[in-house]
């Protein structure tokens, strides 16, 4: 169903002053401002949909330029309960809290929410990134140490009038950025209450959220070309399929990967590349302007539509899942690096996918939008699409029922 | 500019292992996998396995899966390769060499001696 | 796993001479192969990638050619800097495999 119905008040239009206020690049993640604390201690903060804790650096570690600095807030509670989250690879660990809480551009709001202020972390802060925390924007349900420890956003929601809902519009550069050009550069925009109609073109089409605890959402059907890999579409979601933006590749499941593998690889046969390539290890580089787009197929997922046995289709093009890598050895190139890659706990639809796209996350309609995003690179010949509706049936056969575990014990 | 600084030269005994750093500066560590090569006196040159310092993904030559363990501490930017086992024939110079297309910088190599 | 023939095993040449190696695959490696320089008691220096792409700051008298199975590296006027061994690589496949190398001596 397209976004046809009659405006909401304080749901549509201009959103000024939050347009251009992320910062970053797909391979290391997209940041907001944020101030926490009286006075403010202003920290950029990473935007992840992926995840339910707003957890910030507060103890000096190599990769962090600023930390959180509890003692200086006089607005600073301390929840007396420590909080460890351990993810498949690295870990964060801290000490749980409140404090006053904006987003200079953002809302005009000040917000008193739960902060997990980090003292020990590995593989989690990344080297160069600009980032010094972490605003994890899922449900409480996976929120650590337990969902009854309320994320940011259900904080804002219960404390404002500002609406249940923001809408991201990632912008990948298109071409590699060094340091200071990321800190110069647009990354992009995160609305929070609402939908600014500038940032995208065409229709929005919304899929519902299956369960509220990743934004997880069913894919039907998946094309490489227009030529569907004909799996059973269970497949697409085994164990589930999420949108987040913490993530930087499309990851799919192994059966998954391996076949649009084998259908990209023989879309794309007129050159031979290395195995390495599409392990995301080797890049690929062509002389500077030089990249054939066009050798490469569009990949579509159909997403289960608002209407009983109707879907929609999103279609990336090369153009955002060959990642631009800058390697001072192969400077006179434009080289790329393959980003789509396997995963073992479901689709991820990072970056790769988030960067065609303005994607709204209508929580107060448990449903998800996608319209082409006005920042998205794209060639003269082709450009990244949302399109519907197509008759699609037995979806609701698309989606795994997880067996049930405790969550606390599954890793991230 | 990209520098690869290993560890110093080793001398082990039949049976033991040894543990080869490879310190990593310059560029993105997590963006570009690192590649163990190992070239024995007067020999040719042999690739060993690589590994993802993103997420610890690795990927070894069937020859030395038994042996050989690759890990990463991206806290200080540096992969480690472990080798267990040791016999006189792996006497040989260990190189790190970081990925891109091929292996475009190695490290200066560190001279592992087995030797009872 | 993918063999690396590399001829000859050594040369002797003069500088300002012309210098030819040739590597041949075991099968078909695309041009998915490189070419490293490698000086006595030193790490190699990678030259060619792609079969003839230069890395940043090689110098133009490297220069590289092939696809599928044969590959050549060529110099076109030797310097002394040059005197040293050279190795072919594919990165086709898993595992990476090189050539046994190739010795430029003095003449």
């Known amino acids: 169903e397209t976004d046809e119905e009659p405006e909401e008040p304080g749901r549509r239009g201009s959103f000024v002053e939050m347009v251009d206020n992320l910062r970053g690049k797909s391979g290391q993640g997209y940041y907001v401002e944020m101030t926490v604390g009286s006075p403010p201690q202003t920290l950029n903060i990473l935007v992840d949909t992926g995840s339910s804790n707003f957890a910030v650096g507060a103890a000096p570690h190599p990769f962090l330029h600023r930390y959180y600095q509890r003692q200086l807030s006089s607005t600073y509670r301390d929840l007396r309960k420590g909080v460890y989250v351990p993810y498949t690879q690295g870990k964060w660990e801290g000490e749980l809290g409140t404090d006053l809480v904006s987003i200079p551009h953002g809302p005009n709001v000040t917000v008193r929410a739960n902060i997990a202020a980090i003292t020990e972390s590995d593989k989690f802060f990344i080297n160069g990134s600009n980032w010094e925390g972490i605003l994890g924007l899922a449900y409480a349900e996976i929120a650590r140490p337990d969902d009854s420890l309320e994320p940011f956003f259900d904080s804002l929601v219960k404390q404002t009038h500002v609406p249940n809902l923001f809408s991201l519009q990632l912008c990948g550069a298109g071409f590699p950025l060094n340091q200071s050009e990321v800190l110069a550069s647009v990354g992009g925009s995160m609305i929070i209450g609402g939908i600014d109609h500038s940032l995208y073109t065409g229709s929005l089409w919304y899929t519902p959220i299956r369960r509220e605890w990743y934004y997880e959402v069913i894919i039907v059907r998946v094309e490489i070309n227009g030529q569907d890999l004909k799996m059973d579409c269970k497949e697409y979601n085994y164990d589930k399929s999420i949108v987040d933006s913490g993530t930087t590749n499309l990851r799919l499941p192994k059966k998954v990967f391996e076949a649009a593998v084998k259908s990209i690889k023989a879309a794309s046969s007129t050159e031979k590349f290395p195995d390495g390539f599409w392990l995301g290890e080797q890049l690929v580089c062509w002389q500077a302007g030089t990249t054939p787009w066009n050798i490469f197929p569009v990949i579509s997922l159909y997403l289960m539509g608002e209407v009983t046995n109707q879907s929609f289709r999103i279609t990336i093009l090369p153009q955002q899942y060959l990642r631009p890598v800058e390697d001072v050895a192969t400077s006179q190139d434009d080289c790329y690096k393959f980003a789509i890659s396997q995963s073992s706990t479901g689709t991820v639809m990072g970056a790769v996918i988030m960067e065609g796209f303005y994607v709204v996350f209508d929580r107060a309609r448990k449903r998800i939008g996608f319209a082409v995003s006005a920042c998205h690179v794209h060639d003269e010949f082709r450009t990244a699409a949302v399109e519907g509706p197509f008759v699609t049936l037995d979806m609701e056969d698309c989606g795994y029922n997880i067996p049930q575990t405790d969550e606390s014990t599954l890793m991230t | 500019q990209v520098q690869l600084v290993q560890s110093g030269a080793e001398v082990k005994k039949p049976g033991a292992s040894v543990k080869v750093s490879c310190k990593a500066s310059g560029y993105t560590f997590t963006n570009f996998w690192i590649h163990w090569v190992r070239q024995a006196p007067g020999q040719g040159l042999e690739w060993m396995g690589m590994i993802d310092p993103s997420d610890s993904y690795t990927k070894y030559n069937q020859k030395f899966k038994a042996r050989a363990t690759l890990t990463v501490d991206t806290s200080t930017s540096t992969v480690y390769m472990e080798l267990s086992s040791l016999r006189s024939e792996d006497t040989a110079v260990y190189y790190c060499?970081?990925?891109?297309?091929?292996?475009?910088?190695w490290g200066q190599g560190t001279l592992v001696t087995v030797s009872s | 796993d993918i063999q690396m023939t590399q001829s000859p095993s050594s040369l002797s040449a003069s500088v300002g001479d012309r210098v030819t190696i040739t590597c041949k695959a075991s099968?078909?490696?695309?041009?998915?192969v490189a070419w490293y320089q490698q000086k006595p008691g030193k790490s190699p220096k990678s030259l060619i990638y792609s079969a003839s792409h230069r890395y940043s700051g090689v110098p133009s008298r490297f220069s590289g050619s092939g696809s599928g199975t044969d590959f050549t590296l060529t110099i076109s006027s030797l310097q002394p800097e040059d005197f040293a061994t050279y190795f072919c690589q594919q990165y086709n496949s898993y595992p990476y495999t090189f050539g046994q190398g190739t010795k430029v001596e003095i003449k």
């Open positions: 099968q078909d490696v695309g041009r998915n």
């Open positions: 060499a970081r990925s891109g297309v091929s292996l475009p910088y």
